[in-house]
């Protein structure tokens, strides 16, 4: 006997209670593929979530985060509170980046300043909580009469960069 359910298109389900008739998905549910025996419940965007795309009979709702929050996880499964630039979100809330680290975004963690000396360069602009250091030419490049063929100065030990 042919399975009549395979003929049911997306947006419907195969109703076994009605001799395998294709019935439309009930309100607030959907089926994104044909041949489904049930429809899935639509995702609800509530609390810190807001609706980016309404649920239809053939596709689930899609959520974004409300202002002041950003998405985490696949399909925005979580919303995380923003912090200010120069901060990171910890177990105790938004905290300023420690000295020597920075965060130029409203999300994520504070990252260490670039150690210019590891590349044989000098610090052109000091780092802040919000911005990384800007590395400039190597000290040797700045000496009078230096040519472009001058090899880079030997890298100093980490922790001794002029920051």
């Amino acid at each position: 006997l042919q399975d009549l359910c395979s003929n049911c298109p997306a947006g419907t389900f195969c109703d076994n209670n009605r001799s395998q008739i294709c019935s439309p998905c009930p309100p607030n549910s959907f089926s994104s593929a044909g041949g489904q025996r049930t429809c899935d419940i639509c995702r609800q965007c509530k609390g810190v979530f807001k609706t980016r795309k309404e649920c239809s009979s053939t596709s689930n709702a899609e959520c974004d985060c409300i202002s002041g929050y950003h998405c985490l996880g696949a399909e925005c499964s979580m919303c995380e509170q923003d912090c200010k630039q120069g901060q990171e979100l910890t177990k105790k809330g938004c905290k300023d980046c420690c000295f020597g680290t920075f965060n130029d975004q409203k999300r994520g963690i504070c990252r260490p300043w670039t150690n210019c000396s590891l590349d044989g360069k000098s610090v052109l602009v000091n780092g802040t909580k919000e911005r990384d250091v800007v590395c400039g030419p190597s000290p040797a490049d700045l000496s009078p009469g230096a040519s472009s063929a001058t090899p880079p100065a030997p890298a100093r030990e980490p922790g001794h960069s002029p920051q």
Epitope: R43, F49, S77, M78, E80, L89, K92, G93
Partner: nanobody, 122 residues
Framework: EVQLLESGGGLVQPGGSLRLSCAAS????????MSWARQAPGKGLEWVSG???????YYTESVKDRFTISRDNSKNTVYLQMNSLKPEDTAVYYC????????????????WGQGTLVTVSS
């Protein structure tokens, strides 16, 4: 069906106190972390406080030492005791489940109450 029903809001003078309650039903309350959030007029939603199933508590900096979150598993209720209230505490306060256990983070499976209004004014 999961339900969260907040109560206890109202008008209070600066320096005064209020205790908010959130009665929960439709899920295993005793093993669920719970949280409070608030939304001041014209502002965004702010994470206020959270409590793990084991009782560990967390607060946002602005309410620390003034607000206390607690729970009574026998009554399926979470509380927010608010002391030394300030005009800037005026907001709609929401109770929510807190499945992520992470400060300032909620997941799509978390449930939310309808909120209760707290007004701090002289």
């Amino acid at each position: 069906e999961v339900q969260l029903l907040e109560s206890g809001g109202g008008l209070v003078q600066p320096g005064g106190s209020l205790r908010l309650s959130c009665a929960a039903s439709g899920f295993t309350f005793s093993s669920s972390a719970m949280s409070w959030a608030r939304q001041a007029p014209g502002k965004g939603l702010e994470w206020v406080s959270g409590i793990y199933s084991g009782g560990s508590t967390y607060y946002t900096e602005s309410v620390k030492d003034r607000f206390t979150i607690s729970r009574d598993n026998s009554k399926n209720t979470v509380y927010l005791q608010m002391n030394s209230l300030k005009p800037e505490d005026t907001a709609v306060y929401y109770c929510a489940t807190w499945g992520t256990l992470r400060f300032g983070v909620w997941a799509e499976y978390d449930h939310w109450g309808q909120g209760t209004l707290v007004t701090v004014s002289s």
